[in-house]
């Protein structure tokens, strides 16, 4: 049986502007031409979708216009960026990869990346 493996970093610290980036890499059992990548967040054992994009191999990754995610792809590697994060968004972010075409369909789940977000301290008032 051919298995699919998805790798992602264990921990990422978001920037002070609330931006977190990580790489989602997958070992493909087949030669997929259409791939769907989904970022999910796990909170209280519930997994919900954050954003998703389908791309053709060799083409750019395109998320919806109102998505908080952006990304680029290179072979079996996807560079994902999540924006607009706040401290309350700290949590486990899971990368899901689906090989949509050609058949057979494969689905792979990463172990999750724990993203830590620290809200910046407000600037102190200045008399100068």
């Amino acid at each position: 049986c051919k298995a699919m493996h998805v790798a992602q970093p264990a921990v990422v610290l978001a920037s002070s502007r609330g931006i977190a980036s990580f790489v989602c890499e997958y070992a493909s059992p087949g030669k997929a031409t259409e791939v769907r990548v989904t970022v999910l967040r796990q909170a209280d054992s519930q997994v919900t979708e954050v954003c998703a994009a389908t791309y053709m191999m060799g083409n750019e990754l395109t998320f919806l216009d109102d998505s908080i995610c952006t990304g680029t792809s290179s072979g079996n590697q996807v560079n994902l960026t999540i924006q607009g994060l706040r401290a309350m968004d700290t949590g486990l972010y899971i990368c899901k990869v689906e090989l949509m075409y050609p058949p057979p369909y494969y689905l792979g789940i990463g172990n999750g990346t724990q993203i830590y977000v620290i809200d910046p301290e407000p600037c102190p008032d200045s008399d100068f």
Partner: nanobody, 115 residues
């Protein structure tokens, strides 16, 4: 070798309920993912609900609040309780399992929602 056998499909009226079962044999401790993937007529495969290696449970948006996934480890069986069924839930439902995804598949069970 892991084998998955689904049961519980059938014809049901809109608003009705069904409970799908997936009995697993030859199970290995390395199987961390178990889920349900469906294929509606003329459509591609779609992950419906799963229990992830991280311990979280996933539901696709269209079934949230209507479907419930559960797993009985003592019986090596995965269940999908489907309530308030709609015509758009008509599909072949496959049980899938693996270390981190769909390494093993069942033969599928057909669910038809029609009046």
């Amino acid at each position: 070798e892991v084998q998955l056998v689904e049961s519980g499909g059938g014809l049901v009226q809109p608003g009705g309920s069904l409970r799908l079962s997936c009995a697993a044999s030859g199970f290995s401790p390395s199987v961390n993912y178990m889920g349900w993937v469906r294929q509606a007529p003329g459509k591609g495969l779609e992950e419906v609900s799963s229990i992830y290696p991280t311990g979280g449970t996933f539901y696709t948006d269209s079934v949230k609040g209507r479907f419930t996934i559960s797993r009985d480890n003592s019986k090596n069986t995965l269940y999908l309780q489907m309530n308030s069924l709609r015509a758009e839930d008509t599909a072949v439902y496959y049980c899938a399992a693996g270390k981190y995804g769909t390494d093993y598949w069942g033969q599928g069970t057909l669910v038809t929602v029609s009046s």
